[in-house]
């Protein structure tokens, strides 16, 4: 049910990367506005993005309160200029989102290689520990803070002169790998959460190669 001049939202979709979380939906409004509500399974509904003509709503502030909770959102449709109007059942038209559990489902953002240092035939590669919007004690937590040992990084490394990519893994943010003396190598990292069933991998970091300014070489 609902008013004759509003249509229900549809294609409600969660878009989330490193816990920055936006709910998107359709259609673009014509003579109507939307309000979003979000709740945990056992909690109360909280309204966000009041009477908006947007078709997205940033719900990050709500989900970062507990990223391991499962959330449900709903989008209400109101006639523009008459937001008190309700449907025949006494409430405005609305549509529910799929459930969303940030810890299990947020996409892993593209990592960045912070630095690499060669000492003889060893190279230490360090991955930047990206800050998230999750807070604890008024400070923003890093991706490692949130995921702990659930988060691993895979390093792909290869000789500049070849294409075959060797791999290494770490559950810290550092790799120590063996390389051939006198060879230049390139590096790319991928974040992985093996315990997940979906959204397990990030896109690869930008490639960094030896001989570029990020690296440091020391002959021992």
């Amino acid at each position: 049910s609902g008013t004759t001049n509003t249509v229900a939202a549809y294609n409600l979709t969660w878009k989330s990367t490193n816990f920055k979380t936006i709910l998107e939906w359709e259609p673009k409004p014509v003579n109507q506005v939307y309000t979003v509500q979000i709740s945990t399974k056992s909690g109360d509904w909280k309204s966000k993005c009041f009477y908006t003509t947007d078709t997205e709503c940033d719900l990050t502030d709500e989900i970062v309160k507990d990223v391991k909770q499962t959330y449900l959102a709903r989008v209400f449709s109101y006639p523009a200029g008459n937001v008190e109007s309700t449907g025949s059942a006494g409430e405005p038209l609305y549509e529910n989102s799929p459930e969303f559990t940030p810890y299990l489902e947020t996409n892993l953002g593209q990592p960045t290689i912070q630095s690499f240092e060669q000492v003889g035939t060893k190279v230490n590669v360090t991955v930047e520990d990206e800050r998230t919007l999750v807070r604890r004690n008024n400070t923003f937590l890093s991706l490692r803070d949130v995921f702990g040992k659930d988060l691993i990084y895979t390093l792909y490394y290869w000789k500049s002169s070849s294409s075959g990519k060797k791999t290494a893994k770490t559950n810290t943010n550092e790799f120590l790998i063996d390389v051939d003396k006198g060879e230049n190598y390139c590096f790319s990292v991928q974040a992985v959460i093996p315990s997940r069933t979906v959204n397990r991998k990030s896109t690869d970091s930008p490639v960094e190669c030896m001989g570029q300014e990020k690296g440091e070489f020391r002959e021992i």
């Epitope: 691993i152 294409s163 990519k165 791999t167 991928q190 093996p194 069933t197 979906v198 896109t203």
Partner: antibody, heavy 121, light 107 residues
Framework: EVQLVESGGGLVQPGGSLRLSCAAS????????IHWVRQAPGKGLEWVGY????????YYADSVKGRFTISADTSKNAAYLQMNSLRAEDTAVYYC??????????????WGQGTLVTVSS | DIQMTQSPSSLSASVGDRVTITCRAS??????VAWYQQKPGKAPKLLIY???FLYSGVPSRFSGSRSGTDFTLTISSLQPEDFATYYC?????????FGQGTKVEIK
């Protein structure tokens, strides 16, 4: 149910080519890593190469480098082993296997049934 | 490449026996070792991962342990269905490498 099914094996002459397929079901290959392993008659297991279907990264055993190519088609949820310039010593049963991680330790939890490649004139 | 030296290459044992198979890595591989069982004409099956973790569905008579670069697969009480070939494998570095295999035969 997770399953890997290889196909495409057969008899081929030395110098010839063959393309093996590894069709996956019950999981999405882009979330994992796919390895190819072979076993010559009466011999042990020999690693051939791997692909990360998510980004296309590959690496090959020295014995097949430059002759074999691993690829993946995530829309078909399948991986492939293109074998060129085949030699008698490539005769083996070829397996594909899914790799996953336990924290940082890898393990290969699902294997295909294998497909026999015979290189002979 | 890391070599995995597996011993013995074969052994004869009776049902109920305790069987131990060892693998020595040519360099440090941390806990990145798995053990597989293979029966004739079949694909290998994962038994142990991360040196000592029993894979889901594998009987508890199988166990794995690590001491430095030495890795051990133990079958506490051999059952008729355990007669097979066993392989260790390291995946600490690329390329991953297998041991030569241990064939467990009926005495």
């Amino acid at each position: 149910e997770v399953q890997l099914v290889e196909s495409g094996g057969g008899l081929v002459q030395p110098g010839g080519s063959l393309r093996l397929s590894c069709a996956a079901s019950g999981f999405t290959i882009s979330g994992y890593w796919i390895h190819w392993v072979r076993q010559a008659p009466g011999k042990g297991l020999e690693w051939v190469g791997y692909i990360d279907p998510y980004n296309g990264a590959t690496y090959y055993a020295d014995s097949v480098k430059g002759r074999f190519t691993i690829s993946a088609d995530t829309s078909k949820n399948a991986a492939y082993l293109q074998m060129n310039s085949l030699r008698a010593e490539d005769t083996a049963v070829y397996y594909c296997a899914r790799a996953d991680y336990f924290y940082i330790d890898e393990y290969w939890d699902y294997w295909g049934q294998g497909t026999l490649v015979t290189v002979s004139s | 490449d890391i070599q995995m030296t597996q011993s013995p290459s074969s052994l004869s044992a009776s049902v109920g026996d305790r069987v131990t198979i060892t693998c020595r890595a040519s360099q440090d591989v941390n806990t990145a070792v798995a053990w597989y069982q293979q029966k004739p004409g079949k694909a290998p099956k994962l038994l142990i991962y991360s040196a000592s973790f029993l894979y889901s569905g594998v009987p508890s008579r199988f166990s794995g342990s690590r001491s430095g670069t030495d890795f051990t697969l133990t079958i506490s009480s051999l059952q008729p269905e355990d007669f097979a070939t066993y392989y260790c494998q390291q995946h600490y570095t690329t390329p991953p490498t297998f041991g030569q295999g241990t064939k467990v035969e009926i005495k």
